[in-house]
C-alpha cells in the first residue's frame, strides 16, 4: 500500500501531458464546430515568441459568454505564470490584427502540434 500511495495523490502534471491535453481540447473544438465558434468573435493575433501561452490567454479571455473555449482558457492559464484578466494588452499581441476565434484556435492547434513533435513542452 505504501508503494501505491503515490498513485492516490495526483502530483504535478508533466508538461508533455499538459500540452497533449491542451492539443486534444483544441482538436475537440475544431472538430465539433458547427455554428461559427463564439458567434464569430474576433481576437488579437499573437506573436509566437516566449510568453506565447500568456498572449494566447490574454486574447481568448476577452471572449465572454462562449462556453466552447472556457476549458481552453483554464488550460492556458496553467501554462501562464502570471494572472491574466480581460482587457490586458500584451506586447506579444500583433497590434491592429484581429482574427476570428475559430481561426485563432485552429492556428494555435497547428503551432502546439509542432511544439509537441519537437519536444518543446514548456
Amino acid at each position: 500500500l505504501t508503494c501505491l500511495g503515490g498513485f492516490a495523490s495526483p502530483g504535478p502534471v508533466p508538461p508533455s501531458t499538459a500540452l497533449r491535453e491542451l492539443i486534444e481540447e483544441l482538436v475537440n473544438i475544431t472538430q465539433n464546430q458547427k455554428a461559427p465558434l463564439c458567434n464569430g468573435s474576433m481576437v488579437w493575433s499573437i506573436n509566437l515568441t516566449a510568453g506565447m501561452y500568456c498572449a494566447a490567454l490574454e486574447s481568448l479571455i476577452n471572449v465572454s459568454g462562449c462556453s466552447a473555449i472556457e476549458k481552453t482558457q483554464r488550460m492556458l492559464s496553467g501554462f501562464c505564470p502570471h494572472k491574466v484578466s480581460a482587457g490586458q494588452f500584451s506586447s506579444l499581441h500583433v497590434r491592429d490584427t484581429k482574427i476570428e476565434v475559430a481561426q485563432f484556435v485552429k492556428d494555435l492547434l497547428l503551432h502546439l502540434k509542432k511544439l509537441f513533435r519537437e519536444g518543446q513542452f514548456n
Epitope: 482574427i99 481561426q103 485552429k106 492556428d107 503551432h111
Partner: nanobody, 118 residues
Framework: GVQLLESGGGLVQPGGSLRLSCAAS????????MGWARQAPGKGLEWVSS????????YYADSVKGRFTISRDNSKNTLYLQMNSLRAEDTAVYYC???????????WGQGTLVTVSS
Amino acid sequence: GVQLLESGGGLVQPGGSLRLSCAASGFIFAVYDMGWARQAPGKGLEWVSSINDGGNVTYYADSVKGRFTISRDNSKNTLYLQMNSLRAEDTAVYYCATAEDEPGYDYWGQGTLVTVSS
C-alpha cells in the same frame, strides 16, 4: 477570413530581377510554413520554393536554385520571393500559399503574373 495577396509581378527583360510580396491576413502567419508555386501558360502547377515558420529552413526547385531567394517577415505578416537572372521560362502566374502537411491548413492567393520577355 484568410487572405493572401500577392504583388510585385510584371514585365521584365531576361536577366532582370523582380521581388514578389505576399501580404497575409486573417490567420496567425508565423505559425505556417509558406511557399511559392507557379503555373506557366498551358502547363501544370510547379512548386517553386518554401520556407518554414521560423524562416530558417528553405527549399528550392532545381529550376530556380541559385537564382531565387525566399524570405519572410513574421512581424509584417509578409512572404517574399526575390527573383534574379530571370529567364523566359520563368514566365508564369506566381501563387503564394501555405505549405503545411496538416489537412485543413491549405490557403492560396489569387496569383501575380510575371512575364519575362525582351
